[in-house]
């Protein structure tokens, strides 16, 4: 299926140009999306092009500036947040990135009613996290690992926790591993729906081993960065959940929420918290061996001022074929009765689907079914449930939004997006206003992305929010590559692939092939999305064919494919890339003497193992920030898929699946190894060990490090990286510079 027709007529050919590397590095062809910042059922905020914060009312069609760009500029604000009572706005400046989600910032409060900044009892700086209560204008914030509460922005703060200590005790914010591998947020505190209670997590990292690496900076001596980071099998953080009454915080103080007995009997994780009502909360827990998850619904006991989690309100989710959930265990979406909920988990056929749980998981009512997967529940209202899936036309790499009418019996299902802009839009997400009165659809491709506003009752399109006209015009004279998404059937395994072909692709000619791989558990690379990136350039200008293949271990095609890699990372992911390459060669247009593979992070691990597979298929390859041994990576992620690195568990495969063990096999390939020295995620240690093993085996290879760069290799390093990799590939493929 050709998703992007070349739009080239012969007469126009000479006015068209290929993509350049400069185009990619400059972000010339980047697109915009429009996510409304909903503040009610029919109103949203948006930052205009001139940086005013504008409030839009869909029903009246009116808009007005609630915060002037002059005010934003006066504190160099890069972000804002309106209090629910609309009286105050916090302005965020001095953004300083920490890890993937976390950052510190300076916060200023602007009083919209008085038209000036709040001066009394100013917030300390830098703050690690700050948020408004869901109602009114209470503030909760984390400063120096402790949580504070303000009843009003100008009031003095009330200190909730006192034991916070850098790298030791974290209150209201996650430690490194919880941030990256469990919560995927910068915060670990949650307001109850009306702001009566504030729940928070406390992480105790006292006994966690520390990863230490040098940060070279500009000083005479490098700094040492120390992060409590549990690698596979190491001691983990100890987590506790507390809830405090924010109306009378000093009255009884924080109350701990009990952990279910079956969880507390051995090492465990807290995975998420969902408020149901002001006096009912739902906590999810996970055993360290991550195939058992417990969802616990707890109620406030007014008489004792404590939280009670009866065993009858514990729901167990267990996997017998792999780990619990997909990448994470899914979170519940509660219905209006405040006890039953909707949740995505595997059905009896091994496909992730929406289930309705009223009393027990065993009696769950399956809401969706089929050989496809429900991916996200966006919103449940009195009469509708909105979700996304990859059901339509059996393409796993698509996302459409569906509505199930739960108010009628039998429930009827409608695809909201399937036929809206069928060629242009096959991969959607959505953002809903209160009560799903309105929603925005954001289409990511395969055509140029477009964001639209819709009526939540009729699904009628109200207006286009962003259609990327400028991008469309800019691309008119660009020779974009062609893209096709197809599948290979091999030994009862379906391998979906995306092939990116040069603009004047001719099946009778031979082209160099580059495999781009990620391949991590529960990932998906073959998606119907728009992108003009480095591989687009390689196809457009350098005439390469690029392929992405979703093999075993990847997501949204059922548990058989997903859990195939359980306890065996580094085997089937690599096999499936190799199998796909052989099939591509059979297609007749690949020059089998010029095949390369590259990947980043997990993809760097897979590309390294593929290069060292001894097949002779690959001439060269690149690994950027690869994992080299699962003993070096984070406990929460690694153990989910690999178990523990102990003799009586899975130590043998931990040892067998390292890149170092295959050092000898790199002798007949050109290998480029790249890593940032300040990588907090996949530590430089991984590449250092690969390099050491290659040196010890006397195998020649190329390497590049990026001083003081993390896992993202951002800024000027990005330009250097892609320029360097381009030269490497062109040399490998004997393409003139």
């Amino acid at each position: 299926i050709v998703l992007r027709p070349s739009r080239v007529h012969n007469s126009e050919e000479n006015t068209m140009r290929a993509l350049t590397l400069k185009d990619i590095l400059n972000g010339t062809f980047s697109y915009k999306t429009f996510f409304p910042n909903w503040i009610s059922g029919q109103e949203y905020l948006h930052q205009s092009a001139d940086n005013n914060i504008v409030l839009y009312n869909i029903e009246t069609g009116q808009s007005y500036t609630i915060l002037s760009n002059r005010t934003m500029k006066s504190v160099n604000a890069s972000n804002y947040g309106l209090s629910p009572d609309r009286q105050f706005v916090y302005l965020e400046s001095d953004y300083s990135k920490l890890w993937r989600y976390s950052y510190t910032a300076t916060y200023y409060i602007y009083d919209l009613s008085n038209g000036e900044f709040v001066r009394g009892n100013e917030l300390p700086r830098p703050i690690q996290y700050l948020c408004w209560s869901p109602v009114g204008s209470k503030l909760a914030y984390v400063y120096q690992n402790n949580i504070y509460l303000k009843q009003r922005p100008g009031d003095p703060p009330f200190q909730i926790t006192f034991n916070g200590r850098e790298n030791k005790i974290f209150n209201g914010i996650p430690d490194w591993v919880y941030e990256e591998e469990m919560l995927a947020t910068k915060y670990a505190l949650w307001w109850s729906p009306n702001g009566k209670f504030l729940a928070y997590a406390e992480f105790n990292d006292t006994d966690i081993p520390v990863i230490a690496y040098s940060y070279y900076g500009d000083e005479q001596y490098p700094r040492t960065i120390n992060i409590p980071y549990p690698k596979a099998g190491a001691k983990n953080p100890v987590v506790r959940i507390f809830i405090i009454d924010t109306t009378y915080p000093a009255y009884v103080g924080p109350q701990e929420v009990p952990v279910p007995a079956m969880i507390a009997s051995s090492d465990y994780y807290f995975s998420w918290l969902t408020w149901v009502t002001d006096e009912r909360v739902c906590l999810q827990w996970l055993k360290r061996v991550q195939n058992v998850s417990v969802l616990s619904i707890c109620d406030f006991r007014e008489d004792w001022q404590t939280w009670d989690c009866p065993k009858t309100q514990e729901h167990i989710e267990e996997s017998r074929t792999g780990w619990a959930g997909g990448f994470f265990v899914s979170t519940p979406v509660f219905s209006y009765d405040a006890i039953s909920y909707y949740k995505i988990f595997s059905d009896k056929d091994g496909y992730k689907h929406i289930h309705y749980i009223k009393d027990t998981v065993e009696n769950a009512i399956q809401i969706t079914s089929g050989k496809w997967e429900a991916i996200n529940i966006f919103r449940v209202t009195q009469d509708s449930l909105f979700y996304s899936s990859n059901e339509f036309e059996e393409y796993p790499g698509r996302r459409n939004i569906y509505r199930i009418s739960i108010g009628s019996y039998p429930p009827s299902k409608k695809c909201v997006t399937c036929h809206l802009r069928k060629e242009r839009c096959q991969y959607y997400t959505a953002s809903f206003s209160d009560y799903a009165k309105y929603y925005a659809l954001v289409c990511y491709g395969p055509g140029i992305p477009i964001s639209t506003l819709h009526d939540g009752r009729t699904d009628q399109e109200i207006k286009i929010l962003e259609e990327n006209k400028e991008l469309e015009n800019a691309l008119k004279n660009i020779q974009l590559p062609k893209e096709e998404i197809k599948k290979l059937e091999v030994d009862e395994i379906t391998l979906w692939y995306k092939m990116i072909l040069p603009p004047q692709f001719d099946r009778s000619k031979k082209y160099p092939l580059l495999i781009q791989v990620y391949g991590g558990p529960c990932s998906q690379s073959v998606r119907s999305v728009f992108a003009v990136n480095w591989i687009s350039y390689l196809a457009s200008k350098e005439g390469m064919v690029i392929a992405l293949v979703d093999g075993r271990g990847t997501a949204f095609q059922g548990d058989k494919l997903l859990y195939a890699v359980y306890r065996k990372l580094g085997v089937y992911e690599v096999e499936d890339q190799i199998t796909a390459v052989r099939k591509f060669i059979e297609m007749g247009f690949i020059d089998e003497k010029r095949i390369a593979i590259w990947g980043w992070s997990y993809g760097g691990y897979v590309s390294s193992l593929a290069l060292a597979s001894g097949t002779g298929l690959f001439k060269c390859g690149i690994a950027v920030a690869p994992v080299s041994s699962w003993e070096y990576y984070a406990s929460v992620y690694t153990e989910r898929f690999m178990g523990l690195p102990t003799k009586d568990d899975n130590l043998e495969h931990y040892k067998n699946s390292t890149v170092m063990a295959r050092a000898e096999y790199f002798r007949n390939v050109d290998y480029l190894l790249i890593h940032g020295t300040a990588d907090d995620n996949v530590h430089f240690q991984n590449s250092a060990q690969i390099a050491k093993a290659l040196v010890n085996a006397q195998v020649d290879f190329q390497a590049m490090w990026y001083s003081d760069q993390n896992h993202g290799l951002s800024g000027l390093s990005t330009n250097h990286l892609y320029t360097h990799m381009t030269h490497f590939l062109k040399q490998c493929f004997s393409l003139s510079d």
């Epitope: 005010t71 009286q87 009613s113 900044f117 001066r119």
Partner: antibody, heavy 124, light 113 residues
């Protein structure tokens, strides 16, 4: 010359409500917030509350919260202050005053122009 | 709330003489960010609304005679009339606009001796 012209004197019974208007002219209405201040006989000036004409968001002194409602009609460049559940101690002269909006972090302005005042008498 | 206390409650000064009024705030009205004191002085004559004389503790409003001056820092402030004129007979109020609620002093009545 900037003008803030208030409505005339009112005599009200206890428990009743009063609504005082403040019509402004000769300046850009949306560049200033409007505040209401009262002065009971022999008493100090007492701030009641204010409103931002750009967004219609009011801010009230906690002492009056629940009894006072401040609104604006931007098209008429007029602000209103309504006080309900009147009692004898609400007998006072009620003033409106303007205060420049502070866009910058270092700004902050005093009330530079005041209305002529409206005498509200609460008596049974 | 910030409480403003003026002294004296009343003051009788001969024409041409100096009049000094003090104002004390229960907490600082000095803003560390810009080193400005968020304090104003108003003059109110019988049957008239207050008139702004001084803002930021020491800046004269345009059109205000230079015999009026303000000084002070943090919590202690002074309004000085260097040479009292007959038209200066009025009640003078200090007001903080550092934080809400905005609060006024109880007023100082200035008369001619």
């Amino acid at each position: 010359q900037v003008q803030l012209v208030q409505s005339g004197a009112e005599v009200k019974k206890p428990g009743a409500s009063v609504k005082v208007s403040c019509k402004t002219s000769r300046y850009t209405f949306t560049e200033y917030t409007i505040h209401w201040v009262r002065q009971a006989p022999g008493q100090r000036l007492e701030w009641i509350g204010g409103i931002n004409p750009n967004n219609g968001i009011p801010n009230y002194n906690q002492k009056f919260k629940g009894r006072v409602t401040i609104t604006v009609d931007t098209s008429a460049s007029t602000a209103y202050m309504e006080l309900s559940s009147l009692r004898s101690e609400d007998t006072a002269v009620y003033y409106c005053a303007r205060r420049r909006i502070a866009y910058g972090y270092d700004e902050g302005h005093a009330m530079d122009y005041w209305g002529q005042g409206t005498l509200v008498t609460v008596s049974s | 709330d910030i409480v403003m206390t003026q002294s004296p409650d009343s003051l009788a000064v001969s024409l041409g003489e100096r009049a000094t009024i003090n104002c004390k705030s229960s907490q600082s009205v000095l803003y560390s960010r810009n080193q400005k004191n968020y304090l104003a002085w108003y003059q109110q004559k019988p049957g008239q609304p207050p008139k702004l004389l001084i803002f930021w503790a020491s800046t004269r409003e345009s059109g205000v005679p230079d015999r009026f001056s303000g000084s002070g820092f943090g919590t202690d402030f002074t309004l000085t009339i260097s040479s009292l004129q007959a038209e200066d007979v009025a009640v003078y109020y200090c007001q903080q606009y550092f934080s809400y609620p905005l609060t006024f002093g109880q007023g100082t009545k200035v008369e001619i001796k």
